[in-house]
Interface confidence: medium
């Protein structure tokens, strides 16, 4: 089993649709179960949960360039939700996402109809097959949702979308 998310980071516009792509290949002839999971960014104190509070541990983490403080922390330090699952042709939305225009298309791509404020974070595409347990069964994409902002207006003119006050 091999799961690949082609876009590692995706920037999309508030209240606009987006598709998070996921490809997989498998030797199994059984239908795969596709699940998309959302993980919020880590809290500022995620260093404690990783045992990185000591000066020595902080120095170690700085040397480890693969460690990303936004993304790398225990799930207990952030929000984790099932967005949607697909088994055969049946797509089921997680409780939090019920009522939203979200579905799984083209085997494993997550299609979101209208991005909301809290949608920024890490999305995991997880594939389960009953008789192909070897290889890599998940991959992730980071989604950043932006509104129309003066700071970006002349750099990214396409960010001309609606925003909603709190």
């Amino acid at each position: 089993l091999q799961v690949t998310v082609p876009d590692k980071k995706k920037v999309a516009m508030l209240f606009q649709p987006t598709v998070l792509r996921c490809h997989f290949s498998t030797s199994s002839h059984q239908p795969a179960v596709v699940q998309w999971k959302f993980k919020s960014y880590c809290q500022d104190r995620m260093g404690e949960s990783l045992g990185m509070s000591s000066p020595r541990a902080q120095a170690l983490s700085k040397r480890n360039l693969e460690w990303d403080p936004y993304l790398d922390c225990l799930d207990s330090r952030r929000t984790v939700r099932v967005v949607a699952s697909k088994q055969g042709s049946t797509v089921t939305l997680g409780d939090f996402y019920r009522g939203r225009e979200i579905t799984i298309v083209h085997d494993a791509d997550l299609q979101i109809g209208k991005l909301m404020w809290g949608d920024s974070g890490l999305y995991y595409c997880i594939i389960t097959t009953p008789d192909d347990l070897e290889g890599k069964n998940e991959d992730s994409v980071e989604l950043l949702v932006l509104g129309r902002t003066g700071l970006l207006a002349d750099l990214l003119p396409s960010f001309a979308v609606e925003i909603m006050p709190e």
Epitope: V11, Y41, P69, L144, T149, L151, A153, A160, P165
Partner: antibody, heavy 120, light 112 residues
Framework: QVQLVQSGAEVKKPGSSVKVSCKAS????????ISWVRQAPGQGLEWMGG????????NYAQKFQGRVTITADKSTSTAYMELSSLRSEDTAVYYC?????????????WGQGTLVTVSS | DIVMTQSPLSLPVTPGEPASISCRSS???????????LDWYLQKPGQSPQLLIY???NRASGVPDRFSGSGSGTDFTLKISRVEAEDVGVYYC?????????FGGGTKLEIR
Amino acid sequence: QVQLVQSGAEVKKPGSSVKVSCKASGGTFSSYAISWVRQAPGQGLEWMGGIIPILGIANYAQKFQGRVTITADKSTSTAYMELSSLRSEDTAVYYCARGRLPYGDFWDSWGQGTLVTVSS
Amino acid sequence: DIVMTQSPLSLPVTPGEPASISCRSSQSLLYSNGYNYLDWYLQKPGQSPQLLIYLGSNRASGVPDRFSGSGSGTDFTLKISRVEAEDVGVYYCMQALQTPLTFGGGTKLEIR
């Protein structure tokens, strides 16, 4: 409660550079934009530039283009503003300010300010 | 650059009385999404600025409801329904439509 804590006051010679830091705590650094604003003694507020740390994109006011560099270190939730070729008129209090994405341009939290004095 | 002009420069007010500050921009701050990219800040003596109003009329978290923002396009107003002693300081409007983000010159509110 979000806090932005800035580095201490600096006295610099004309022609030199200064680097001011701004450490964020009590919120997810990834969800914000950081801007730098300065205020000369007895004067109003002047926007210098800003950065969206998660994108690594910075934008500068034309007036400071080529002299200012704004960066952010995700691993320490710290933003930096470096101003080079200092002159006496750069004497000011320098503030960092945080704006929540997806908007980012209204600043709901400010640092305490860093006084930079440029004098020979 | 968008030029922001505030008036009056100085505003002496008796506690309990209303106050009004005007801000005018050199070009419209009304974007096609229907929002005015205009924010108001207050800088109390010896302190950092604090956000009062964003997007023309939205009160920031924790800001008393005696503060209100109105206006559209190029003309904006910050109103304080009943001024209190703690409201003294310099009020700034700022446009966030495009960079460079620019501020008005400030209005100093003082207690009479």
